[in-house]
Interface confidence: low
């Protein structure tokens, strides 16, 4: 493991006076009960709090929210409450914060059964002052911003009605009844699912998928027979209900729902589901579930339109009970995704994809460690790190794995080394190459943040006891060093940075507990001045990522081009700064057949990577739907992966010749119930879906 | 392999109450609307009541409303009817339901609820 | 409250033979209506739903069709196991549920 805190670490000095001057304590006047914290605005200081406190009566629930504002990052707090005429705040729907810079925020209250509608309280000056505004009905959900435009806002009532704001909440319009799901689309438009029925829990599969482009003036019914739809990058997905009525397929727009076309993907059964696990602009990760209740489905990626898809891992994690998956993309290097697999033993086992999802890998543990009881090898194992699987357990994990953009290649996640996720108490590792190369950071499991872009680490032992000490690393994790930050332990209940990493401000959150009271308390360290000068040009050095094989004329080739990054050396302690921005240089490749999907009918043996066809379309003419014509391939098997930009080298050549036939993916017309796919048959049996799941782009 | 197994009925007396249970398998019990339905013996089947997956929405039908509590505990994989005054015409096999579609795809084995003095 | 009127009440066939169940809804309730088999002792056994589909695992000679008001089970050729007591059942709401009195398909 990394040196703890030994003398070969290079220590910062002074830190305990220096963090001691920056460190400022809020006791919260209030009784304990639930406090929620956001950020209002991008480097603005601004952090808005909210207690709740509430006593479930016989008839009704009494409560009292208390609303506090900060404009310095959480060293001060002043009660707001009064802003708010001391109103018990709705906390299931939490504070909608509106998109960017925006500095609106909106707090929907508590009130009375008979009341003919809601009320929101709305705030466009960064919580200075807000304004009380009665809804002409009951909001089922928090408001949804247009990520165009701050001033339009989207709520779906208790009665199933879609209501619109043009003006930040202070007009509502119902533009339409009976919506069962409603989102933001691209340039102002808005997607919806309506029963005309007027039943939204029990008709999945019934459902009219709508969009308007005008806030409700108009509307374009853009497929039928829908059970769900997502949005992920630009393509628009819904699971339609086939000619059968008991399969569902996915069909993909990327035209806003003008046109479908059918998903080369298995079909599913009512009791199974898709998910989008990732999307972007160029390409889509799919999770298609096994038949049956198995815990686990297959993670398909797809080409540039996706329509076409290509096997990327089988016996994918993805719990049909609770919906929790592993799938992780790891933001401080492209390409990187990690996730579990089920085994065929039943253990649970990580993998890593560096290209993604071209090939997946098991993560190498790091060169010191032993094995543990899980390993059947003492000598062979591998690190395996706890996610969303883990935590839904109930195992000691209280934090998923964190990566950041602007912290290139720096990983920090719980796990344990051995053949399987272990049961057993886990450690912190840190990578700081995007997941090649991992080291045991911190003994047993931690809370922890990254602060300015990856200069500073911080952590706090997850402890059921009081807390009153914080770690923080200035070397990525490799050297730790302890402060006290209260002489008094408090509970602790949470990490608090501002979201971005790009802050030098860390809150601790917790409480403290006398025989007569119990009271919120927070603690903000600033590390200003431990990263006490600016970074220059001789603090970084240059890194090129995914780099396996520095004598290789294509090292670092992900994806058709490798990156050289600017790096801060471990040793420099100072300040990337709020401004720092990724300095990297990329560089095209020449393409390898790593570098092309297997086309449509096309798969790539295990440890192989040619494309051969698949034995049952041998000898036969490739038809398949595409842009509601069936299309003629001819092909020898290849496709660019999505955002792969490599030049020359291997040039598979591909043509596509059109037949001229109709082939819809007529399942959204209801009219219209012959549609041929070519998409694998398999599937039974009843209905698991819910969007929106934890970073994961769609859940049925 | 989705399984119901209702339990809780019996004899009682006009005016009395009982508590049925329902425990399910072999699907993911959150994700369904379920249903109870009775049958008075040899007379057709009628509607109860239903309550949704997540337990915030349920409906009864009329000459049990205010009476008869439907209730589910999804960490537990039950669904409940707690009856309340209950009346010599609730007499009946009760059964406990899984929703598909338009109607009930699964149904448990039934447990008979006889109300007499 | 929507009612749902089934006939005949009793259709005395032999096997082989073609049955036609009707069931007719006081108002229209779209295509939400399930049709169940159900023998002596037994749970009922859903057959049809959204009036047209069958359910998992029902052989191809059941069918249905119909919307809006009228609806119909056909049983295209009866075999021995075929003789029970069919009942229709509509969804008009979200979680309001009602039951026809049934058809009772016996042995001529």
């Known amino acids: 493991s990394a040196p703890g805190e030994d003398e070969e670490c290079g220590r910062v000095r002074d830190f305990v006076a220096k963090l001691a001057n920056n460190t400022h304590q809020h006791v919260f006047d209030d009784l304990r009960g639930s406090v929620s914290l956001s950020w209002v605005g991008d480097s603005t200081g601004v952090i808005l709090v909210l207690t709740t406190f509430h006593v479930p009566l016989v008839i009704m629930t009494f409560g009292q929210s208390k609303l506090y504002r900060s404009e310095d990052y959480g060293k001060n707090f002043k009660d707001i409450t009064d802003l708010i005429n001391n109103t018990f705040i709705r906390t299931e729907f939490g504070m909608a914060i509106g998109p960017e810079n925006s500095g609106k925020v909106v707090l929907t209250a508590e009130v009375s059964g008979g009341s003919r509608g809601g009320r929101i309280f709305r705030s466009s000056d960064f919580a200075k002052n807000f304004v009380q505004t009665d809804l002409p009905f009951h909001p089922l959900t928090q408001m949804m911003y247009s990520p165009q435009n701050s001033d339009y806002l989207l709520a779906l009532s208790t009665e199933n009605g879609l209501w619109v704001s043009k003006n930040f909440g202070g007009k509502w319009e119902e533009i339409h009844k009976t919506v069962c799901l409603a989102k933001w689309g691209r340039k102002g438009t808005i997607f919806f699912t309506a029963n005309h029925n007027g039943s939204c829990s029990n008709d999945r599969g019934m459902l009219e998928l709508e969009r308007t482009t005008d806030y409700g003036k108009s509307f374009k019914t853009v497929a039928s027979k829908i059970y769900s739809f997502g949005l992920g990058g630009k393509f628009l997905f819904a699971s339609v209900m086939t000619g059968k009525g008991t399969l569902r397929a996915i069909h993909v727009s990327v035209d806003d729902g003008d046109t479908w076309n059918m998903a080369q993907l298995p079909p599913v059964g009512h009791e199974q589901f898709y998910s989008i696990l990732a999307a972007n602009d160029e390409m889509v990760f799919m999770h298609v579930d096994e038949p049956g209740d198995s815990g686990f489905g297959t993670i398909y990626v797809s080409d540039d339109r996706g329509t076409v898809y290509s096997k990327s891992l089988e016996r994918h994690l993805y719990t049909t009970t609770g919906g929790e998956t592993d799938f992780i993309n790891v933001t401080s290097l492209r390409g990187v995704f990690t996730t579990s697999i089920l085994a065929e033993d039943k253990s649970v086992q990580s993998v890593i994809s560096f290209d993604q999802g071209g090939e997946w890998v098991p993560l190498r543990k790091p060169a010191d460690s032993k094995c543990d009881a899980t390993a059947r090898d003492p000598e062979k194992c591998s690190l395996h790190i706890h996610a969303a699987y883990s935590i839904a357990t109930g195992l000691n994990v209280p934090m998923l794995p964190l990566s950041e953009p602007n912290a290139v290649g720096l990983v920090l996640a719980h796990g344990s080394v051995g053949d399987a996720i272990s049961v057993m108490r886990p450690d912190v590792y840190v990578s700081d190459d995007g997941g090649y190369t991992w080291i045991k950071a911190l003994e047993g499991p931690h809370y922890y943040t990254i602060l300015d872009s990856g200069g500073i680490i911080v952590a706090i032992e997850h402890s059921s006891r009081p807390i009153n000490v914080i770690k923080f690393s200035t070397d990525e994790g490799q050297c730790w060093q302890t402060y006290t930050f209260t002489r008094d332990p408090i509970y602790f209940t949470g990490l608090a940075s501002e979201p971005g990493a790009r802050s030098m401000n860390i809150s601790i959150w917790g409480f403290t507990e006398s025989f007569l009271t119990s009271q919120w308390v927070s603690y903000t360290i600033d590390f200003k001045d431990i990263l006490e000068r600016n970074c220059e040009e001789k603090d970084y050095t240059i890194w090129l990522a995914h780099s396996t094989d520095p004598e290789d004329y294509e090292d670092g080739c992900i994806l058709g081009y490798k990156e050289q990054f600017l790096r801060l050396r471990k040793s420099s302690v100072c300040q990337n700064g709020r401004d720092y921005v990724v300095t990297k240089q990329p560089s095209i490749c020449l393409c390898s057949l790593e570098d092309f999907l297997c086309d449509f009918g096309y798969y790539r043996p295990e440890n192989d990577s040619k494309c051969v066809e698949q034995p049952e379309l041998k000898g036969h003419d490739l038809e398949f739907c595409l842009y509601g014509r069936e299309e003629h391939l001819t092909t020898n098997g290849y496709r660019k992966i999505p955002g792969d930009k490599c030049q020359g080298g291997v040039n598979p050549v591909r043509e596509v010749k059109d037949l001229k036939k109709k082939c819809t993916s007529n399942f959204l017309s209801p009219e219209k119930q012959n549609s041929k796919s070519n998409g694998s048959a398999g599937g039974s049996g009843g209905l698991n879906d819910i969007f929106e799941a934890q970073k994961i782009e769609w859940h049925e | 392999e989705v399984q119901l197994l209702e339990s809780g009925g019996g004899l009682v007396q006009p005016g009395g109450s009982l508590r049925l249970s329902c425990e399910a398998s072999g699907f993911t019990f959150r994700s369904y609307v379920m249903s109870w339905v009775r049958q008075a013996p040899g007379k057709g089947l009628e509607w109860v009541s239903t309550i949704s997956g997540g337990g915030g929405n349920t409906n009864y039908t009329d000459s049990v409303k205010g009476r008869f509590t439907i209730s589910r505990d999804n960490s537990k994989n039950t669904l409940y009817l707690q009856m309340n005054s209950l009346r010599a015409e609730d007499t009946a096999v009760y059964y406990c339901?899984?929703?598909w579609g338009s109607g009930f795809d699964y149904w448990g084995q039934g447990t008979l609820v006889t109300v007499s003095s | 409250e929507i009612v749902l009127t089934q006939s005949p009440a009793t259709l005395s066939l032999s096997p082989g033979e073609r049955a036609t169940l009707s069931c007719r809804a006081s108002?229209?309730?779209?295509?939400?209506l399930a049709w169940y088999q159900q023998k002596p002792g037994q749970a009922p056994r859903l057959l049809i739903y959204?009036?047209?589909n069958r359910a998992t695992g029902i052989p191809a000679r059941f069918s249905g069709s119909g919307s809006g008001t009228d609806f119909t089970l056909t049983i295209s050729s009866l075999e021995p196991e075929d003789f029970a007591v069919y009942y229709c059942?509509?969804?008009?709401?979200?979680?309001?549920?009602?039951f026809g009195p049934g058809t009772k398909v016996d042995i001529k």
């Open positions: 339901a899984k929703n």
């Open positions: 959204d009036a047209s």
């Open positions: 108002q229209s309730v779209s295509s939400y």
């Open positions: 059942q509509q969804r008009s709401n979200w979680l309001i549920f009602t």
